[in-house]
Interface confidence: low
Amino acid sequence: KETAFVEVVLFESSPSGDYTTYTTGLTGRFSRAGATLSAEGEIVQMHPLGLCNNNDEEDLYEYGWVGVVKLEQPELDPKPCLTVLGKAKRAVQRGATAVIFDVSENPEAIDQLNQGSEDPLKRPVVYVKGADAIKLMNIVNKQKVARARIQHRPPRQPTEYFDM
């Protein structure tokens, strides 16, 4: 279970055409459900139930986005439509280049993602928790253009990371 180094860039523009770019860094873990690869793309927040929809015509995005899914407490969804692994697969089928799960509320998902699938996804499936997850969700919840770069080694140059 290697460390995943995630750099998130938030892009905020104003009507005047001015803009600000914020960078923050966090760490997660590559799960065995996916590949230990670098990936990058625009962040698309996905609700766990949103991944239940089987209609592939709906909710398709251009290829190359990074899906971010905050998993809920198991008690809130006792009979999930898909396993966590199934949700990751569904996101990749829809064009995600990587999936990041916030497992803070559902730590059991870590074991599910690391059970060593016979047919792991060819894209990275990363999980984050604790302070790193809070950082990530703070950015995602801003509903602004944000981009995630996932690397399996630390960034080449030290980037100063700022809490949002």
Partner: antibody, heavy 121, light 109 residues
Framework: EVQLVESGGGLVKPGGSLRLSCAAS????????MSWVRQAPGKGLEWVGF??????????EYAASVKGRFTISRDDSKNTLYLQMNSLKTEDTAVYYC????????????WGQGTLVTVSS | DIELTQPPSVSVSPGQTASITCSGD??????VHWYQQKPGQAPVLVIY???QRPSGIPERFSGSNSGNTATLTISGTQAEDEADYYC???????????FGGGTKLTVLG
């Protein structure tokens, strides 16, 4: 009006050094991620390098062709971007443009008019 | 790095549609941007993120990107559109910004 104005170009001998400046106005320079792009006479565009803003830790990255010889820096208090060019080669002869970058430095939405650097003996 | 290949030249009659292509390995999984450059002038961004048009750019400019090819389309081409056009992408694997070789668009007549 959003504007970028380059200066500092000129004739320099191979192995020599030169520093280009780019004065920015009409936008919040300290927020911007800035880049240099060059164009050899009669040729296409070539990305040179970039610098992130303060929030990005002023990180810089360079094209392989200039790495180790060129250094990008900025002075936010003066709204100015710099390109320090050392160990210049004849193939560095080009018009050098500074450009503002948008969307994680994918695209360049504002360009200066360019300044010509000629490296010749 | 990803390499972007453009045809050196494209000719079109006024009022017709001009299509300029940019090809590269799996280019459809990258964002592609297009610039127009007239002689002696700086480049101008005409399309970003495959198909977005900056404010001030006429609606006749449009873009698409899928598979290995991105295309800049100029419908109802006008004489003032005669220029060099460059595609560009951000190759995040190598953290470099890559330009195509450029295409000279000639408006006949």
């Amino acid at each position: 009006e959003v504007q970028l104005v380059e200066s500092g170009g000129g004739l320099v001998k191979p192995g020599g050094s030169l520093r280009l400046s780019c004065a920015a106005s009409g936008f919040t320079f300290s927020n911007a991620w800035m880049s240099w792009v060059r164009q050899a006479p009669g040729k296409g565009l070539e990305w040179v390098g970039f610098t992130k803003n303060e929030v990005g830790g002023y990180t810089t990255e360079y094209a392989a062709s200039v790495k180790g010889r060129f250094t990008i820096s900025r002075d936010d208090s003066k709204n100015t971007l710099y390109l320090q060019m050392n160990s210049l080669k004849t193939e560095d002869t080009a018009v050098y443009y500074c450009a503002r970058a948008i969307y994680y430095l994918e695209a360049f939405d504002v360009w200066g008019q360019g300044t010509l650097v000629t490296v010749s003996s | 790095d990803i390499e972007l290949t453009q045809p050196p030249s494209v000719s079109v009659s006024p009022g017709q549609t001009a299509s300029i292509t940019c090809s590269g390995d799996s280019l459809g999984s990258y964002y592609v941007h297009w610039y127009q450059q007239k002689p002696g002038q700086a480049p101008v961004l005409v399309i970003y993120r495959n198909k977005q048009r900056p404010s001030g750019i006429p609606e006749r400019f449009s873009g698409s990107n899928s598979g290995n090819t991105a295309t800049l389309t100029i419908s109802g081409t006008q004489a003032e559109d005669e220029a060099d056009y460059y595609c560009q992408t951000y190759d995040w694997m190598y953290s470099s910004r890559v330009f195509g070789g450029g295409t000279k668009l000639t408006v006949l007549g």
